[in-house]
Interface confidence: medium
């Protein structure tokens, strides 16, 4: 931020009233009026330049410090060149010298040269030549100056002419405050800027109302440098709960808005299915029926535990069971959707029920289902199932209700036989098969039908209470299609899958296991 | 020594024109700001018009605005006063004056000019 | 325009006499004053500008005086050469104007 200037004197602002003391009197500087740009203007004057050795002094009146430590003095004023007069003017000068003088009174019209201290020779940059003279083009120069530490109450300047030909239109000074400050939302008062040039005055910022420092944040700090120029700004303020930054205020968020957290963020709009909020709000309530989970963020729409499974079938093969279904109507707004699935059987000869989940099993873990499908295996023939299929998404625990569809589906075959050629010859196969054990006791016999490939009008059958046979009596280097049956005193269970097994060739003979 | 010398008075009927002349010598006469004053007989001293030394800017009275014209050329040290449209109260001696800043002991200088040098005059009369 | 009244319009004074001729402006033209000398059939002469400075080869009995809109020309001890009218003059402003002079006659 731009420094700012406190005036002391300024002599332009004055209107040729301030009275300036000259020494030696009535002689050397001299106050006069022209006029610039139709408007009169007052200048100190000298122009001894013919005269030879001068010493003329003007004297301000005395300023009062007050609380400055660092005054800067700006001065605007012109010097004739010394070749614009005859002869050159040989004691001619092109520059006069700056004095202060600190004191804690008034000396009034006691001036005493020995009292000053020389600031510094000023000199112009650019010197008024004659045609700039005849053609009254006032070449101004400006020239700053500081001093400082000062101590006592008060201090003259004092400007001492050598034989120039110079007038003062501007004597202005001033010190220097950083401004009062509103950054980051924080408060910086206005404060006095310091007398040492490499110094920086640190000052702490004060949170504007309803900001606050950010948790881990750093408390708002400023430096005031010698220039009043505010500098390396550090830490800062964010708007609370429920305010936002609106220019360098925090502004309560407006009804039907919230903020839940100190943050430069703006109030944001109450999601859907939430209630109005009132002004300030940190966050907005859920409508009835409708829930925020734990981890959801106030941003987040309130939302309501899904509908259940929209359409649910169970395909029975044998003894398994595929499950499908398809996502809830529904979903409560959520994309968290997963889905449990449970097992009931029931033996139909007592009606009895009970869990099922310790005999089953499942294609994929049954709880925190994510995909729509799940198929269930060894099942036992001859019972009735009823699989439960729940949908749930993170605001099911919320409420107590569940959303579920439930299918039925009786198993009234075995499983097919797993089947595999153990052995092969010119003339024989041999076969086996597996079936899951809770079935097996559920079989009386296993059926063994095998025929010629490409032969439709015979087959053979043959009966075995074991795992195994061996066929027979066939011909070399020729397929056959073999397909292995469960019997069981309820009527055949599901058949296997045809195999097709080729006899070895001839020249190939001997037993070759597969 | 400063010498400014008019020339080109004379008797001319009201309406008329005339062009009065200044010869200078004895000073730079590019450095000076020159002017014209006129002296109406039996009367006080009236300016009339000033011309900057390189030949800008110009002022005229207002009673001569729009038919007097001044001019000057440097490299014939002279000073013109070309005046048309002649009245009988435009009968007078007109003097040629000269300011040179250098000898003005002053800063800044003043808004206008006083004159430091003039010449003998020259009388112009307007008369039917 | 501003106006330049002199007083009085004419005086008698001896020799040696002190004679102070003063000039009014309409408005406040600061220092910015000069006095000329004028004799009959002759130009005018320039005595004094920024109201109390001296021209170069001006009798030091001549002096000014005054600032803003009240100005006085003093000649300490009146000599036979004196004799003349004498004018003033503004140049605060481009309109140059003179006052309608003051003759100075022997008594």
């Known amino acids: 931020a731009q420094g700012k200037e406190v005036v002391l004197l300024d002599f332009a602002a004055a209107g040729g009233e301030l009275g300036w003391l000259t020494h030696p009197y009535g002689k050397g500087w001299d106050l006069m009026q022209n006029i610039m740009n139709d408007m009169p203007i007052y200048m100190y004057s000298v122009c001894n330049v013919m005269s030879g050795d001068q010493d003329n002094w003007l004297r301000t009146n005395w300023v009062y410090r007050g609380e400055a430590e660092r005054i800067f003095i700006e001065l605007k004023f012109t010097v004739r060149d010394c070749n614009s007069f005859p002869g050159g003017a040989s004691s001619c000068k092109e520059t006069f010298n700056l004095y202060y003088a600190e004191s804690d009174l008034d000396y009034g019209t006691n001036f005493q040269k020995r009292l000053f201290t020389k600031i510094d020779t000023i000199a112009p940059d650019e010197i008024t030549v004659s045609s700039d003279f005849e053609a009254r083009h006032v070449k101004l120069n400006v020239e700053e100056r500081s001093v400082g530490p000062l101590t006592r109450k008060g201090f003259y300047l004092a400007f001492q002419d050598i034989g120039a030909c110079v007038a003062l239109l501007s004597v202005r000074v001033y010190y220097k405050k950083c401004p009062e400050l509103l950054q980051g939302l924080a408060h910086f008062p206005e404060t006095i800027a310091g007398s040492d040039a490499p110094s920086l005055a640190t000052v702490a910022g004060t949170c504007v109302d309803h900001a606050v420092v950010p948790p881990g944040g750093e408390e708002p700090r400023m430096h005031c440098a010698v220039d009043g120029e505010w500098l390396v700004p550090i830490g800062q303020c964010l708007c609370q709960a429920g305010y936002e930054k609106v220019e360098d205020a925090c502004q309560a968020c407006s009804p039907g808005f919230f903020k839940f957290e100190a943050s430069e963020s703006p109030c944001l709009e109450c999601p859907e299915h939430t209630l109005p909020s009132p002004e300030g709000a940190t966050s907005c309530e859920c409508e009835e029926g409708f829930f925020r989970a734990p981890q959801d963020p106030a941003s987040m729409p309130c939302t309501r535990p899904p509908s259940a499974p929209h359409y649910l079938t169970a395909v029975g093969m044998g003894a398994k069971v595929e499950l499908r279904w398809t996502p809830p109507q529904d979903s409560g707004g959520r994309e968290d959707i997963v889905y449990s699935v449970t097992c009931e059987q029931c033996w139909p000869e007592s009606g009895e029920c009970g869990p099922c989940e310790a005999s089953v099993r499942y294609s994929e873990p049954p709880h925190g289902l994510t995909r729509t499908s799940v198929t269930v295996s060894d099942l036992e023939p001859h019972m009735n199932y009823t699989f439960t299929v729940e949908a749930r998404n993170g605001v099911s625990g919320l409420v107590t209700s569940r959303s579920f569809r439930t299918a039925s589906v009786s198993i009234n075959q075995t499983e097919p036989p797993k089947v595999r050629l153990e052995g092969r010859s010119t003339t024989s196969l041999s076969v086996s098969w597996s079936i899951p054990p809770p079935q097996q006791s559920r079989v009386w016999k296993y059926e063994v039908t095998y025929r010629k490939k490409g032969d439709s009008n015979s087959y053979n059958v043959r009966r075995t209470e074991g795992f195994s046979v061996t066929l027979d009596d066939l011909a070399p280097d020729t397929t056959y299609l073999v397909q292995v049956q469960a019997l069981t005193q309820e009527g055949q269970g599901a058949g296997s899958k045809v195999h097709e097994f080729q006899t070895l060739s001839p020249e190939g003979s001997g037993n070759l296991a597969v | 020594e400063v010498q400014l010398l008019e020339s080109g008075g004379g008797l001319v009927q009201p309406g008329g024109s005339l062009r009065l002349s200044c010869a200078a010598s004895?000073?730079?006469?590019?450095?000076?700001?020159m002017a014209w004053v006129r002296q109406a007989p039996g009367k006080g001293l009236e300016w009339v018009s000033r011309i900057g030394p390189s030949g800008g800017p110009t002022h005229y009275a207002d009673s001569v605005k729009g038919r007097f014209t001044i001019s000057r050329d440097n490299s014939k040290n002279t000073l013109y006063l070309q005046m048309n449209s002649l009245r009988a109260e435009d009968t007078a001696v007109y003097y040629c004056?000269?300011?040179?800043?250098?000898?003005?002991?002053?800063?800044?200088?003043?808004?206008?000019?006083?004159?430091?040098?003039w010449g003998q005059g020259t009388l112009v009369t307007v008369s039917s | 325009d501003i106006q330049m009244t002199q007083s009085p319009s004419s005086l008698s004074a001896s020799v040696g006499d002190r004679v102070t001729i003063t000039c009014r402006a309409s408005?406040?033209?600061?220092?910015?004053l000069a006095w000329y000398q004028q004799k009959p059939g002759k130009a005018p002469k320039l005595l004094i500008y920024k109201a109390s400075n001296l021209h170069t080869g001006v009798p030091s009995r001549f002096s000014g005086s005054g600032s803003g809109t009240e100005f006085s020309l003093t000649i300490s001890s009146l000599q036979p050469d004196d004799f003349a009218t004498y004018y003033c003059?503004?140049?605060?402003?481009?309109?140059?104007?003179f006052g309608q002079g003051t003759k100075v006659e022997i008594k």
């Open positions: 408005q406040s033209i600061s220092t910015w």
């Open positions: 003059q503004q140049y605060q402003s481009y309109s140059r104007t």
């Open positions: 004056a000269g300011y040179d800043s250098g000898y003005d002991y002053v800063a800044v200088a003043g808004p206008a000019e006083y004159f430091q040098h």
């Open positions: 004895g000073f730079t006469f590019s450095h000076y700001m």
